[in-house]
């Protein structure tokens, strides 16, 4: 199971990196286009990965003004990078009953980023609890 647990660790590192990136972007909310974006909240169990992909697909945009433009766009690019695959992620990809991205309430960038962080924290918590209980599924 060594390679499996290494994959899990890579996944955890990536999710924590994503939280850092979200926190970084929150510093620049005034430099983001004030567009309303689908922002999943209170995501039902087993739909976390579906909601995660909604956050990644959202068209978060820099206002392209001032000297923060490059930092913001690099951070947005980092947010969209695919995380290492996990068994739970693979399983959830086959689930067809999760809400579509458009069905989620739309929020401005500040709340969008807060909700994204909240989902990432939930996914990390689930991941840790599943490992504590001896499962390597999530």
């Amino acid at each position: 199971h060594k390679s499996s647990s290494q994959g899990q660790d890579r996944h955890m590192i990536r999710m924590r990196q994503l939280i850092d990136i979200v926190d970084q972007l929150k510093n620049y909310v005034n430099d983001l286009v004030p567009e309303f974006l689908p922002a999943p909240e209170d995501v039902e169990t087993n739909c976390e990965w579906s909601a995660f992909s909604c956050f990644q697909k959202a068209q978060l945009k820099s206002a392209n003004t001032g000297n923060n433009e490059r930092i913001i766009n690099v951070s947005i690019k980092k947010l969209k990078r695919k995380p290492p695959s996990t068994n739970a992620g693979r399983r959830q990809k086959h689930r067809l009953t999760c809400p579509s991205c458009d069905s989620y309430e739309k929020k401005p960038p500040k709340e969008f980023l807060e909700r994204f962080k909240s989902l990432l924290q939930k996914m990390i918590h689930q991941h840790l609890s599943s490992r504590t209980h001896g499962s390597e599924d999530s």
Epitope: Q24, N67, N68, E69, V74, K77
Partner: antibody
């Protein structure tokens, strides 16, 4: 393995034009931010131009020294990056490197192609 | 434009001894805890290779005798024990904003 291979360099007279190409492989080119960086003989590195990914709508950016004369472009279907250089000056003489800007820093570089502008 | 000034412009080091290169920016390249400064080594006849990104992060595959530090306007690249293969020109580069600029380079040679 990531590979970037430049071509199109050569000798050109002042005022002339040249088109550089860069063939990319080993990574998802359409997602990449690509840049040209040049190095005059015996000198340091100078950033020339950048083109971002399809997801960013391919915006382009230029150093002041080449603005209005050089055009960076890409063809994602061919995994290729280009630099069209017009109104060339002697000070444009340099090795031109094709590079991938991967989040923080130029991670991958080609071997470079030499452009000589001389009469 | 942010101007990067490297010192010294050249240094000669005995193998096994440490080396240090400084890079000073004309304005801060740090913001909200991140420092947008990177270091490269260009070996003779080769393109540059990334050594350190975001001031202190070692690029994958780079020996851990290389380290970076600093924030704001002052940055340092250190080599704990110089080896023969470390010869070449070292450049700092910022990505705080466009245009991206490089330092003028520091040539390292072996005594």
């Amino acid at each position: 393995e990531v590979q970037l291979v430049e071509s199109g360099g050569g000798l050109v007279q002042p005022g002339g034009s040249l088109r550089l190409s860069c063939a990319a492989s080993g990574f998802t080119f359409s997602d990449a931010w690509m840049d040209w960086v040049r190095q005059a003989p015996g000198k340091g590195l100078e950033w020339v131009a950048e083109i971002r990914s399809e997801a960013d709508n391919h915006p382009t950016y230029y150093a002041e020294s080449v603005k209005g004369r050089f055009t960076i472009s890409r063809d994602d279907s061919k995994n290729s990056l280009y630099l069209q250089m017009n109104s060339l000056k002697t000070e444009d003489t340099a090795v031109y490197y094709c590079t991938e800007y991967d989040y923080e820093g130029f991670v991958h570089w080609g071997q470079g192609t030499l452009v000589t502008v001389s009469s | 434009d942010i101007v990067l000034t490297q010192t010294p412009l050249s240094l000669s080091v005995t193998p096994g001894q440490p080396a240090s290169i400084s890079c000073r920016a004309s304005k801060s390249v740090s913001t909200y805890g991140y420092s947008y400064m990177h270091w490269y080594l260009q070996k003779p006849g080769q393109p540059p290779q990334l050594l350190i990104y975001l001031a202190s992060n070692l690029e994958s595959g780079v020996p851990d005798r290389f380290s970076g530090s600093g924030s704001g306007t002052d940055f340092t690249l250190k080599i704990s024990r110089v080896e023969a293969e470390d010869v070449g020109v070292y450049y700092c580069q910022h990505s705080r904003e466009l245009p991206l600029t490089f330092g003028q380079g520091t040539k390292l040679e072996i005594k």
